[in-house]
């Protein structure tokens, strides 16, 4: 067990803070909840503290919760491939470019680390080149989320990892909006981290609303499990 992994044996409180600017529309989001890495489970609630969110909530899911991949459930035989937990408590910087097909892009930078007993994800997001009447600024996405695999490779030069994946957002007219994600994670501290073999995170997310919440918000339940590396059985004759 890595030193960081010991921090995730129980339920851990999570705080998410995002400052965003998309085509000049500035906004802030605060989120709170908890993660349980034993089950790869995240429960989070987010509010836009600046009024109405200028972009659809589903376009921010990867920035919020795929941002705290330290809560992914790594099976016993894959624990030595868990970069995310090994970087804790000092944490990691996560940078992404998210390119929406035939539309604009988000660039995000986040610091994910422990502050006391809380895992904090502080994010800056900048979005440019979006069409004012497109699927994103035109709010044409359905309020739901598909299952995805996040493919992870080691980045030995930067002592971190890279990840690539495509998100499929459902559009109200029945079509799909693709969002290409290019992700890079580097440790904040200078302690040893685990650099993984190639594998993937299998992610399932459910979006809902709190009927009593008056502010623009999103409730998120997510399960994430690492896979893609076979278990080696040693046979003794």
């Amino acid at each position: 067990m890595s030193k960081g992994e010991e921090l995730f044996t129980g339920v851990v409180p999570i705080l998410v803070e995002l400052d965003g600017d998309v085509n000049g529309h500035k906004f802030s989001v605060s989120g709170e909840g908890e993660g349980d890495a034993t089950y790869g489970k995240l429960t989070l609630k987010f509010i836009c503290t600046t009024g109405k969110l200028p972009v659809p909530w589903p376009t921010l899911v990867t920035t919020f919760s795929y941002g705290v991949q330290c809560f992914s459930r790594y099976p016993d035989h894959m624990k030595r491939h868990d970069f995310f937990k090994s970087a804790m408590p000092e944490g990691y910087v996560q940078e992404r470019t998210i390119s929406f097909k035939d539309d604009g892009n988000y660039k995000t930078r986040a610091e994910v680390k422990f502050e006391g007993d809380t895992l904090v994800n502080r994010i800056e997001l900048k979005g440019i080149d979006f069409k004012e009447d497109g699927n994103i600024l035109g709010h044409k996405l359905e309020y739901n989320y598909n299952s995805h695999n996040v493919y992870i490779t080691a980045d030995k030069q930067k002592n971190g990892i890279k990840a690539n994946f495509k998100i499929r957002h459902n559009i109200e007219d029945g079509s799909v909006q693709l969002a290409d994600h290019y992700q890079q994670n580097t440790p904040i501290g200078d302690g040893p981290v685990l650099l993984p073999d190639n594998h993937y995170l299998s992610t399932q997310s459910a979006l809902s609303k709190d009927p009593n919440e008056k502010r623009d918000h999103m409730v998120l339940l997510e399960f994430v499990t690492a896979a893609g590396i076979l278990e080696h059985h040693h046979h003794h004759h």
Partner: nanobody, 119 residues
């Protein structure tokens, strides 16, 4: 557990002002005021985050009511101006363990017993 005690309620004429106080027995996160009129559900009125960077008010009180807090005294206040008969209710103070300001009742961990405001 944290105890919350409200004070400052009373009878006031329409157009008048009242300042409600809520003293907490220890540190809290976000704090809010809810109200409940006879025969109606308890509703969020206004609140302030634990970091004091975020406040929020329902439309019916915006511009008339103000929430502020004193973290040294572990006290939150509700300044009510230009009071209307429809503001008549029992006003409850509520607190969360954590800092984010939500408006849903179910997000609050601690509640006071309420103070009556009659306009």
């Amino acid at each position: 557990d944290v105890q919350l005690v409200e004070s400052g309620g009373g009878l006031v004429q329409a157009g008048g002002s009242l300042r409600l106080s809520c003293a907490a027995s220890g540190p809290t996160g976000a704090m809010a005021w809810f109200r409940q009129a006879p025969g109606k559900e308890r509703e969020f009125v206004g609140g302030i985050s634990g970091s004091e960077t975020d406040t929020y008010y329902v439309d019916s009180v915006k511009g008339r009511f103000t929430v502020d807090r004193d973290n040294v005294k572990n006290t939150v206040y509700l300044q009510m101006n230009s009071l209307k008969p429809e503001d008549t209710a029992v006003y409850y103070c509520a607190a969360r363990r954590r800092i984010t300001l939500f408006t849903s009742r179910t997000d609050y961990d601690f509640w006071g017993r309420g103070t009556q405001v009659t306009v």
